[in-house]
Interface confidence: medium
C-alpha cells in the first residue's frame, strides 16, 4: 500500500520509515530506492544501511533521524518536481520472506513564492565524491560522498509535523513502523 507525502520545490522532503530494533545496536539492514519495492531488494537504490552504519548514499539523500534506534526516515534535500514519485523503504529482516516493505508516494508542489535568486551551495564541490563501493546488487557500484553538514532548520515543516506523536502513532497504524524481535 502507498502513503502520500508532500513537499514544495526547494524544500527538503521527509519520508518516514521506522522499525524497532530487537536490542540496542542490533540493527537490521535497510535500503531506500526510487520506485515501488520490487520482488526483492530495492530498485534504483539511493541509500542503504547495514548492521552498523549508512554504507551507501547518493548526493541529496540522507537519514536525519537516529537510525541506530530504528528511525530510517529518508530526507531528500532541495527537491525538484522530478523527485515526485514512489519511494521504497525496505527493512531487510534476515530470513526468507521476512522483509518489510513500504511504498511511500512523494508529491512535489511548485513553490508558493519565488524567492530572489540566491547562490545555491554546491554540494558536489563542498563534499567531494571520494570512494567507490560494491555492495549487494549492481545498484551499489557508485561513488560515495561525505554526508552534508546541514542545519536542522532546513528540514521542511512537514518533517517536524511528522515527528508529532499523534502523527507518529498514525504512521504506526498505517504499517510504517514495525517491531522486530
Amino acid at each position: 500500500s502507498e502513503v502520500e507525502y508532500r513537499a514544495e520545490v526547494g524544500q527538503n522532503a521527509y519520508l518516514p520509515c521506522f522499525y524497532t530494533p530487537a536490542a540496542p545496536g542490533n540493527l537490521v539492514p535497510v535500503c531506500w530506492g526510487k520506485g515501488a519495492c520490487p520482488v526483492f531488494e530495492c530498485g534504483n537504490v539511493v541509500l542503504r544501511t547495514d548492521e552498523r552504519d549508512v554504507n551507501y548514499w547518493t548526493s541529496r539523500y540522507w537519514l536525519n533521524g537516529d537510525f541506530r534506534k530504528g528511525d530510517v526516515s529518508l530526507t531528500i534535500e532541495n527537491v525538484t518536481l522530478a523527485d515526485s514519485g514512489i519511494y521504497c523503504c525496505r527493512i531487510q529482516i534476515p530470513g526468507i520472506m521476512n522483509d518489510e516493505k513500504f511504498n511511500l508516494k512523494l508529491v512535489i508542489k511548485p513553490a508558493k513564492v519565488t524567492p530572489a535568486p540566491t547562490r545555491q551551495r554546491d554540494f558536489t564541490a563542498a563534499f567531494p565524491r571520494m570512494l567507490t563501493t560494491r555492495g549487494h546488487g549492481p545498484a551499489e557500484t557508485q561513488t560515495l560522498g561525505s554526508l552534508p553538514d546541514i542545519n536542522l532548520t532546513q528540514i521542511s515543516t512537514l518533517a517536524n509535523e511528522l515527528r508529532d506523536s499523534r502523527l507518529a502513532n498514525d504512521l504506526r497504524d498505517s504499517g510504517a513502523t514495525i517491531r522486530i524481535g
Epitope: P29, G35, V39, F40, N44, V45, E51, P94, I96, H136
Partner: antibody
Framework: QIQLVQSGPELKKPGETVKISCRAS????????MNWVKQAPGKGLKWMVW????????TFADDFKGRFAFSLETSASTAYLQIINLKNEDTATYFC???????WGQGTSVTVSS | DIVMTQTPLSLPVSLGDQASISCRSS???????????LHWYLQKPGQSPKLLIY???NRFSGVPDRFSGSGSGTDFTLKISRVEAEDLGVYFC?????????FGGGTKLEIK
C-alpha cells in the same frame, strides 16, 4: 500488464554495429532498473549489465566493458544495447530484463556472419 | 566470479513424477544482510526465461505450488512435485548476491 518488447532480429557482418531496443510498458520505467542478458546459441545465460534507470548509471560485468554501449530514452521508456565492431562470438539472443529480473523481453537475435 | 553448477544436465521424467534439480555455488550466497539471493527460472524453447522462485524458496506470482525451492549457503534444490507437460524446458538457477550476477548452466527437463 508489465511488458518488455524488444526490436526484431538483426543480421550483420563482422566489424559492423548493431543497436537493439527494449520498450517497457505497464509500469513507470524510471522506477526500476534494467538488465541486459546474453544467450549464445545452445548456451546458458550471461548477465551483461544493470542500469539504474533513474540516474542512468550502469554496472557492467567485466566481459562487456569494451565494445558494448548501454543507453536509455526515458521519455520513450526504452533501453538500448549497442555493440560496435561486431565479432562472430557476438552471435546470440540478447534479452532485456527488468530490475531484479522478474520480467523479461522476448529476446532479440543478432547473427554476425560474413 | 561466482560459479553456479547445476546437476543433472538433463533430467528425463515421466509426467506425474517428481523432479529434483540441484544448484551449487562456488561461494556462499548468504548476503551480509542475511538474505540469500538465489533464484530459479524456466526457459521454454523459443521463449525468454520466466522467474519461478526467488530468494531460495518464494514462488513468484502465478507459479503453481507444485514448484518448491530449498537450500542454504552453497547448496540449493528445485523440486517439482508432479511434472506436467507445460513444465518441460530448461531450468536455470541464478545468484544476485555478488556482482557480477551469474547463472547456472541449465538443466533440461524432458519426457522419458
Amino acid at each position: 500488464q508489465i511488458q518488455l518488447v524488444q526490436s526484431g532480429p538483426e543480421l550483420k557482418k563482422p566489424g559492423e554495429t548493431v543497436k537493439i531496443s527494449c520498450r517497457a510498458s505497464g509500469y513507470t520505467f524510471t522506477n526500476y532498473g534494467m538488465n541486459w542478458v546474453k544467450q549464445a546459441p545452445g548456451k546458458g545465460l550471461k548477465w551483461m549489465v544493470w542500469i539504474n534507470t533513474y540516474t542512468g548509471e550502469p554496472t557492467f560485468a567485466d566481459d562487456f566493458k569494451g565494445r558494448f554501449a548501454f543507453s536509455l530514452e526515458t521519455s520513450a521508456s526504452t533501453a538500448y544495447l549497442q555493440i560496435i565492431n561486431l565479432k562472430n562470438e557476438d552471435t546470440a539472443t540478447y534479452f532485456c530484463a527488468r530490475d531484479t529480473m522478474d520480467y523479461w523481453g522476448q529476446g532479440t537475435s543478432v547473427t554476425v556472419s560474413s | 566470479d561466482i560459479v553456479m553448477t547445476q546437476t543433472p544436465l538433463s533430467l528425463p521424467v515421466s509426467l506425474g513424477d517428481q523432479a529434483s534439480i540441484s544448484c551449487r555455488s562456488s561461494q556462499s550466497l548468504v548476503h551480509s544482510n542475511g538474505n540469500t539471493y538465489l533464484h530459479w527460472y524456466l526457459q521454454k524453447p523459443g521463449q525468454s526465461p520466466k522467474l519461478l522462485i526467488y530468494k531460495v524458496s518464494n514462488r513468484f506470482s502465478g507459479v503453481p505450488d507444485r514448484f518448491s525451492g530449498s537450500g542454504s549457503g552453497t547448496d540449493f534444490t528445485l523440486k517439482i512435485s508432479r511434472v506436467e507437460a507445460e513444465d518441460l524446458g530448461v531450468y536455470f538457477c541464478s545468484q544476485n548476491t555478488h556482482v557480477p550476477w551469474t547463472f547456472g548452466g541449465g538443466t533440461k527437463l524432458e519426457i522419458k
